[in-house]
């Protein structure tokens, strides 16, 4: 049975041309974590495995950095980085948990956060 | 669809280097989700797995065969490349390049391979 | 290392008959990470099942793999003359490094 929650920074917005931390938190289960995958829509942005450490998707090498420490950074923001995001917490044993957040990138300077929220 | 090639010198002289190179056809080695791997097969024995490397150069070998072995890439020409050192004829095989989806997860195997070439170690 | 011992070394069937072959593990081995494979002679392995049970692309109903923890199981139900190979387990773990089973030959009886 699948206990887990997957915390995350719900919605966001960043400015056009600054850097956004995506972070998930997995809590409430013993799961091993033995990967996590970061996706845009059905696009592949980076993976974090257990064993193997992190692995940035050719596209993004120059735009995405791995952490702190299970999140990414998105640098050199545009506005077609706005869409939605999902952490994928592959888990031993008990299977695959998902977050989503929301980035909205903001041609002007009045990006600010929303408000944290929970996906079971 | 995807394909696999291996190539190299089909005799190596003991205590030398073996080199052999894998292109790939028909899709790119800069694949966010694969590794690409080293697999081989002494003549009428099992498979024994040499290691693997992601496009941006990270590896993970085994253990056994690690001292000996470098794999390296280049995305330019979509191809890997495996060296083992100070060979000895215990490392005469068939030489294997294949498509490692170690990242993948629940589908981790090596799904796609090259036909293999055979290499003899002797003097 | 993860040892895998598959049984038997040789299997003498005939065509229309159902093979099970046998792969088992040293130590626990997520379902995930087992694969089966068939080869045959002056050929590259083929991937057959990947995450114990499900068959790759283009692989026939007959072939199914079950298993889980350290004991796992390939199955053809029909032999068909093309089966006739060599088959190996594989585990795809990274530490302890992935490792091979030595092998089950499905022979003509």
């Known amino acids: 049975m699948m206990t887990g929650t997957i915390e995350t920074t719900g919605n966001i917005s960043a400015e056009k041309g600054g850097s956004i931390i995506l972070q998930c938190h997995l809590s409430s289960t013993t799961a091993q974590v033995t990967q996590v995958n970061w996706e845009q829509q059905d696009q592949l942005l980076a993976i974090c495995n257990a064993d193997l450490g992190w692995h940035i998707s050719p596209s993004f090498k120059d735009r995405v950095a791995p952490g702190p420490g299970l999140g990414l950074t998105l640098q050199s923001l545009t506005v077609n980085d706005t869409g939605e995001y999902f952490c994928i917490y592959h888990t031993y044993p008990d299977g695959t948990y998902t977050g989503r957040i929301f980035l909205e990138v903001l041609e002007s300077s009045v990006a600010e956060h929303g408000a944290r929220f929970q996906i079971p | 669809q995807l394909q696999l090639q291996e190539s190299g010198p089909g005799l190596v002289k003991p205590s030398e280097t073996l080199s052999l190179t894998c292109t790939v056809s028909?899709?790119?080695?800069?694949?966010?989700?694969?590794?690409w791997g080293w697999i081989r097969q002494p003549p009428g024995k099992g498979l024994e797995w040499i290691g693997s490397?992601?496009?941006?150069?990270?590896?993970y070998y085994n253990p056994s065969l690690k001292s000996r072995v470098t794999i390296s890439v280049d995305t330019s020409k979509n191809q890997f490349s495996l060296k083992l050192s100070s060979v000895t004829a215990a490392d005469t095989a068939v030489y294997y390049c294949?498509?490692?989806?170690?990242?993948?997860?629940?589908?981790?195997?090596?799904?796609?391979w090259g036909q293999g070439t055979m290499v003899t170690v002797s003097s | 290392e993860i040892v895998l011992t598959q049984s038997p070394g040789t299997l003498s069937l005939s065509p229309g008959e159902r093979a099970t072959l046998s792969c088992r593990a040293s130590?626990?081995?997520?379902?995930?990470?087992l694969a089966w494979y068939q080869q045959k002679p002056g050929q590259a392995p083929r991937l057959l099942i990947y995450?114990?049970?499900s068959r790759a692309t283009g692989i026939p109903d007959r072939f199914s793999g079950s298993g889980s923890g350290t004991d796992f199981t390939l199955t053809i139900s029909r032999l068909e003359p093309e089966d006739f190979a060599v088959y190996y387990c594989?585990?795809?773990?990274?530490?302890?490094?992935?490792?091979f089973g030595g092998g089950t030959k499905v022979e003509i009886k």
């Open positions: 294949a498509r490692d989806g170690v990242l993948t997860l629940n589908k981790r195997s090596f799904d796609i």
């Open positions: 028909g899709g790119s080695i800069a694949s966010g989700s694969y590794y």
């Open positions: 490397i992601y496009y941006s150069g990270q590896t």
């Open positions: 130590q626990s081995v997520s379902s995930s990470y």
């Open positions: 995450g114990a049970s």
């Open positions: 594989q585990q795809h773990t990274v530490r302890p490094p992935l490792t």
